[in-house]
């Protein structure tokens, strides 16, 4: 769930998600609309798609709590628990490392970006 995601993003990126990513651009944080503003925003849009897919599979994406290990900068999603828990971990791991890969293009001006300015076509999943 959300607690897992926050912890994982902090471990991988070194940034506090609540201060750096939720919200950011047009897709990081709750909801999402329009064209992603940059590579970091694209990470979140892809993550939204990942969650949307799990929702169609009946997974409780905000409630399910999964186990994972973080060591030497890597995330190992546990094969414990239900299918949904395992897949949720995979979605969160992907976004965490995507955000890390794009730290060099992170733009402070996109933090708390005003969502009405998010125009254009929302990318399909």
């Amino acid at each position: 769930g959300i607690l897992n995601l926050n912890k994982m993003v902090k471990q991988v990126t070194g940034k506090m998600p609540i201060l750096s990513y939720w919200p950011y651009g047009c897709h990081c944080g709750l909801g999402g609309r329009g064209q992603p503003k940059d590579a970091t925003d694209w990470c979140c849009q892809t993550h939204d798609c990942c969650y949307d897919h799990l929702k169609t599979q009946g997974c409780s994406i905000y409630k399910d709590y999964y186990r994972y290990n973080f060591s030497q900068g890597n995330i190992h999603c546990s094969d414990k628990g239900s299918w949904c828990e395992q897949q949720l971990c995979a979605c969160d791991k992907e976004v965490a490392f995507c955000l890390k890969r794009n730290l060099d293009t992170y733009q402070k001006r996109l933090r708390f970006y005003w969502r009405p300015h998010c125009r254009g076509q929302t990318p399909g999943c």
Epitope: Q57, D79, G81, S82, C84, E85
Partner: antibody
Framework: QVTLKESGPGILQSSQTLSLTCSFS??????????VSWIRQPSGKGLEWLAH???????RYNPSLKSRLTISKNTSRNQVFLKITDVDTADSATYYC?????????????WGQGTLVTVSA | QIVLTQSPAIMSASPGEKVTISCSAS?????MYWYQQKPGSSPKPWIY???NLASGVPARFSGSGSGTSYSLTISSMEAEDAATYYC?????????FGAGTKLELK
């Protein structure tokens, strides 16, 4: 060869605590990825999953019974335990311990013979 | 929790007859697992991840399905197939079983 065997009190009174032991051989609960579940089956009825314990002592419980269940293990003695508090006649059942398959960790490939527990009012 | 509804609850089949046992999930699941149980014995693993036969299961058995609808099929009923069959999911917690389908020999 993997084997599991359950043992229990046989008969106990309502409101007592049920203590079950699963003794196994052919694998070790210190092996990464390994785990054991408890599953019960009232006479003539279906199966109900109760709890699971992993090699690293991570535990999972059926939410409908969580407040009454405690699963634990003794890795060196190859045993897994289940305690059910405040039992009722509805807890009368055959209790199985089971181990998932390595090739499919959501399939219980190995089962004990079961131990019959009767709760009298 | 996901509720698995098996149908029929009881059925009988003649030797050589094709048999289909259904398992319907209250919400979509990724895989279904099946067990065979005979009176006085523990359940045996029968089918895993929807369509894979467990070790020692005769090839006349097959499994299929997706979403909320799954089934176990016996292409040609044999006397030794008389048993109760249970479906199981662990798509989401908690792990749940169906109530079982008792298959009798006609």
């Amino acid at each position: 060869q993997v084997t599991l065997k359950e043992s229990g009190p046989g008969i106990l009174q309502s409101s007592q605590t049920l203590s079950l032991t699963c003794s196994f051989s052919g694998f070790s609960l210190s092996t990464s990825g390994m785990g054991v579940s408890w599953i019960r089956q009232p006479s003539g009825k279906g199966l109900e999953w109760l709890a699971h314990i992993y090699w690293d002592d991570d535990k999972r419980y059926n939410p409908s019974l969580k407040s009454r269940l405690t699963i634990s293990k003794n890795t060196s003695r190859n045993q897994v335990f289940l305690k059910i508090t405040d039992v009722d006649t509805a807890d009368s059942a055959t209790y199985y311990c089971a181990r998932p398959a390595f090739y499919s960790n959501h399939l219980f490939a190995y089962w004990g013979q079961g131990t019959l527990v009767t709760v009298s009012a | 929790q996901i509720v698995l509804t098996q149908s029929p609850a009881i059925m009988s089949a003649s030797p050589g007859e094709k048999v289909t046992i259904s398992c319907s999930a209250s919400s979509s699941v990724s895989y279904m697992y099946w067990y065979q149980q005979k009176p006085g014995s523990s359940p045996k693993p029968w089918i895993y991840r929807t369509s894979n036969l467990a070790s020692g299961v005769p090839a006349r058995f097959s499994g299929s399905g997706s979403g909320t609808s799954y089934s176990l099929t016996i292409s040609s009923m044999e006397a030794e197939d008389a048993a109760t069959y249970y479906c199981q999911q662990y798509h989401s917690s908690p792990l749940t079983f169906g109530a079982g389908t008792k298959l009798e020999l006609k």
